[in-house]
Amino acid sequence: AQYTRPSNVSNIDVSTNTTAATLSWQNFDDASPTYSYCLLIEKAGNSSNATQVVTDIGITDATVTELIPGSSYTVEIFAQVGDGIKSLEPGRKSFCTDPASMASFDCEVVPKEPALVLKWTCPPGANAGFELEVSSGAWNNATHLESCSSENGTEYRTEVTYLNFSTSYNISITTVSCGKMAAPTRNTCTTGITDPPPPDGSPNITSVSHNSVKVKFSGFEASHGPIKAYAVILTTGEAGHPSADVLKYTYEDFKKGASDTYVTYLIRTEEKGRSQSLSEVLKYEIDVGNESTTLGYYNGKLEPLGSYRACVAGFTNITFHPQNKGLIDGAESYVSFSRYSDAVSLPQDVAAAHHHHHH
């Protein structure tokens, strides 16, 4: 049979997902119901590996599968009739498959830094990069991330800095390729904690009796993490700035003369049965010298006529020595200290003085 050459196809339409493209086209020849169509699909930059699809007669659509996400392709469509008589020119169309979303990403806190490290494996296929969005309340930040390669299963990471401590952030990462955006991948991550900011003031110390004092102080600001505990520290020595080293000393050490500074009382804030908001500052009043015990610390009677200063340690993380039961491990804890109070001098023991006078 004799056939005239088919005219070229036109109006090529493409709809894509990550790994497939559905193509449809038109041919306006009267004889088009007798045509089949030959499709050549070529990945950009890879002409040696073209995929060929031939449709059944009269069919003007085709779905091509096993494509690579986020990649650019060109399709050429020839109309053909009889024994391979093809249209002079193919219809041509460039298209991109949709980029693949990131499967998931993990967050890691950075110890003692207001930052998060995000880690992910590259999604399959090609990408031009990623959009990163970080949001918490009214604050938000959008930034671009560089592209990655999925070929070797490498773990990629980025550090998100200039955040707040102990704060929950909504994080979203969107894959971009060929000007297309995948569905975003989301996670909620919370930043870590660090030493609390030291308070401006110092505790207030007042004499109650010849062997006890009252220490009043305000709760530390919780912007670096929730305050987990307070330690009340007494000294009879020079009131320099305390260090974490003093946390190991007890009333017993003081009595033995091993140290002129010791921890007399420990407050675990969880025991108060209430959560403390960032702006809420609690007031504390501690009776020092009442012979109570908190964990490994004995709140022993003070020396009459002694001169004492008080300081408060606040903890966002309190760690105890594994071998020294109930004693704080200062090096492993997140702690800061108030300044020492002014000194208070205790009165003499009136009863003892009276007894001495009669002898």
């Epitope: 959009e131 969005e133 938000n140 671009h144 000007g179 297309k180 955006m181």
Partner: antibody, heavy 117, light 107 residues
Amino acid sequence: EVKLVESGGGLVQPGGSLKLSCAASGFTFSNYYMAWVRQAPTKGLEWVAYITNSFGSAYYRDSVKGRFTISRDNAKSTLYLQMDSLRSEDTATYYCSTVPLGAFVYWGQGTLVTVSS
Amino acid sequence: DIQMTQTPHSLSASLGETVSIECLASEGISNYLAWYQQKPGKSPQLLISHANPLHDGVPSRFSGDGSGTQYSLKIRNMQPEDEGVYYCQQGYKFPYTFGAGTKLELK
């Protein structure tokens, strides 16, 4: 096929308000960062506002901050720009656009806003 | 704000000629540089994003190059349909900023 169609432009007096809309089709609107770009008559292009996909965070150029509000309705695949306290220097053709990785990829045909007394 | 200085302001080229448009950013923009073509009465069209990848359907006679602060758009084999105004734009930092444009005419 990606299609963006702006509407809502017109003539408004200084100090007045207008709300522009941009109807999107042919792509998954909710996945995309979107933006408004404007072009004053016979002038160059100027980015106006930008909105993210996940949390709808908005960013503005300084000259429109506090006067313009960008928003989106993913269910309707529509982007909006509420323009208040309009000034003569806001006179321009306003385009909506998709904006992955900081590039304005697909553009609408634009809608003309004229601020004049 | 990052300033984008585009040169030349205008140029005319003969059919088949190669033309180049330069764009200088006032600070490094990590290749977040796009090029657009705009014809009279039409919306701008993206040609190139991320300094060099061609957008879908853009003829291969267009190419982008550059890094850091200096970028260029090259058009080989000038065609009548290439007439128009060309803009560069940085998408690295808010506010996103455009060059002032280069008007390309056919000689």
